[in-house]
């Protein structure tokens, strides 16, 4: 069995992907390992090959079907196993029962676009990607805006406590370059976490009109 220095963590994107990371101190980098998924009430099973992402951690994506297909539900339990090759046979390294809708991490929002920009304001919209229809409107978002001379880590977080796929940024500086990011999280799930941040959207506010107080 794997000792306390090992970790096996997986998340479900709510549609057809389970992403897993397995880490073990002292494991050989060239060891061939895989993750095997067996749902308790489905006819299919799936395997992915763990590929190194750092000195002692490996990752892989279990592709369960077409990206927008609903492959698992709230009642499913998936048994996940880490198997590593030892000579001619596979050795089980870890076994985890995984409730997909308790371990959600959605894909990053996509299709960010500027709907309207002014001197001090900018209206931005986006779309969620590969998100289950089960959520209905039970999603929340966080957004952040990168101002000149600052880092993303310094950017204050704006929280949208509902499924609102747009935002109106206020009190911006005229004729200034900004970047904007957003992430999404379902409200349900014991270990549900934020999606990755979206790709940044760059935009520039309009210059102030000369001789006018805007």
């Amino acid at each position: 069995a794997v000792n306390g220095t090992s970790q096996f963590t997986c998340f479900y994107n709510s549609r057809a992907n389970i992403s897993c990371v397995w880490s073990q101190d002292g494991a050989l980098q060239d060891t061939s390992c895989q993750v095997h998924a067996w749902p308790d009430r489905r006819r299919w099973n799936q395997t992915c090959e763990l590929l190194p992402v750092s000195q002692a951690s490996w990752a892989c994506n279990l592709i369960l079907g077409a990206p927008d297909s609903q492959k698992l539900t709230t009642v499913d339990i998936v048994t996940l196993r880490v198997l590593c090759r030892e000579g001619v046979r596979w050795r089980v390294m870890a076994i985890q029962d995984f409730k997909p809708f308790e371990n959600l991490r959605l894909m990053a929002p996509i299709s960010l676009q500027v709907v309207h920009v002014e001197t001090h304001r900018c209206n931005i919209s986006w779309e969620i990607s590969q998100a289950s229809h089960y959520f209905e409107r039970h999603l929340e978002f966080e957004a952040r805006t990168l101002s000149p001379g600052h880092t993303w880590e310094e950017a204050p977080l704006l929280t949208l406590k509902q499924k609102q796929e747009w935002i109106c940024l206020e009190t911006l500086t005229p004729d200034t370059q900004y970047e904007f990011q957003v992430r999404v999280k379902p409200l349900q799930g014991e270990f549900t976490t934020w999606s990755p941040w979206s790709q940044p959207l760059a935009f520039r506010t309009k210059p102030a009109a000369l001789g006018k107080d805007t």
Epitope: V2, G4, F8, T9, Q96, D97, E102, N103, E190, F191
Partner: nanobody, 127 residues
Framework: QVQLVESGGGLVQAGGSLRLSCAAS????????MGWFRQAPGKEREFVAA????????MYAVSTEGRFTCSRDNAKNTVYLLMNSLKPEDTAVYYC????????????????????WGQGTQVTVSS
């Protein structure tokens, strides 16, 4: 803090099944991660399974080979261990345990991680 009482042990033939129950009282059950351990005569206490506070993740000892299923019902303050395809080597006293600290369900916990223990229930598998 909770008190734990196991039940469901007994004598079973190889290949048979048993379902152990662990009833908790005197505390907020949903604030504890729960685990099952076993101890065979003359051997050290061995990890069997552990489940998180909400049951979203459950880790199993590799030795269970997928034959055991651990589940919890927070409404009933009970954690279960369903044991199928039992083997003589599964013979042991089975203990239920509760962990007050946070457990992510992503690693194998040690017996020292658990603070509260039941008195155990004997499981004997005959060949």
């Amino acid at each position: 803090q909770v008190q734990l009482v196991e039940s469901g042990g007994g004598l079973v033939q190889a290949g048979g099944s048993l379902r152990l129950s662990c009833a908790a009282s005197g505390g907020t059950f949903s604030s504890y991660a729960m685990g099952w351990f076993r101890q065979a005569p003359g051997k050290e206490r061995e990890f069997v399974a552990a489940t998180t506070r909400g049951g979203g993740r459950t880790m199993y000892a590799v030795s269970t080979e997928g034959r055991f299923t651990c589940s919890r019902d927070n409404a009933k303050n009970t954690v279960y261990l369903l044991m199928n395809s039992l083997k003589p080597e599964d013979t042991a006293v089975y203990y239920c345990a509760a962990m007050t600290s946070y457990y992510s369900g992503t690693y194998y916990p040690d017996s020292s991680d658990f603070d509260i223990w039941g008195q155990g229930t004997q499981v004997t598998v005959s060949s």
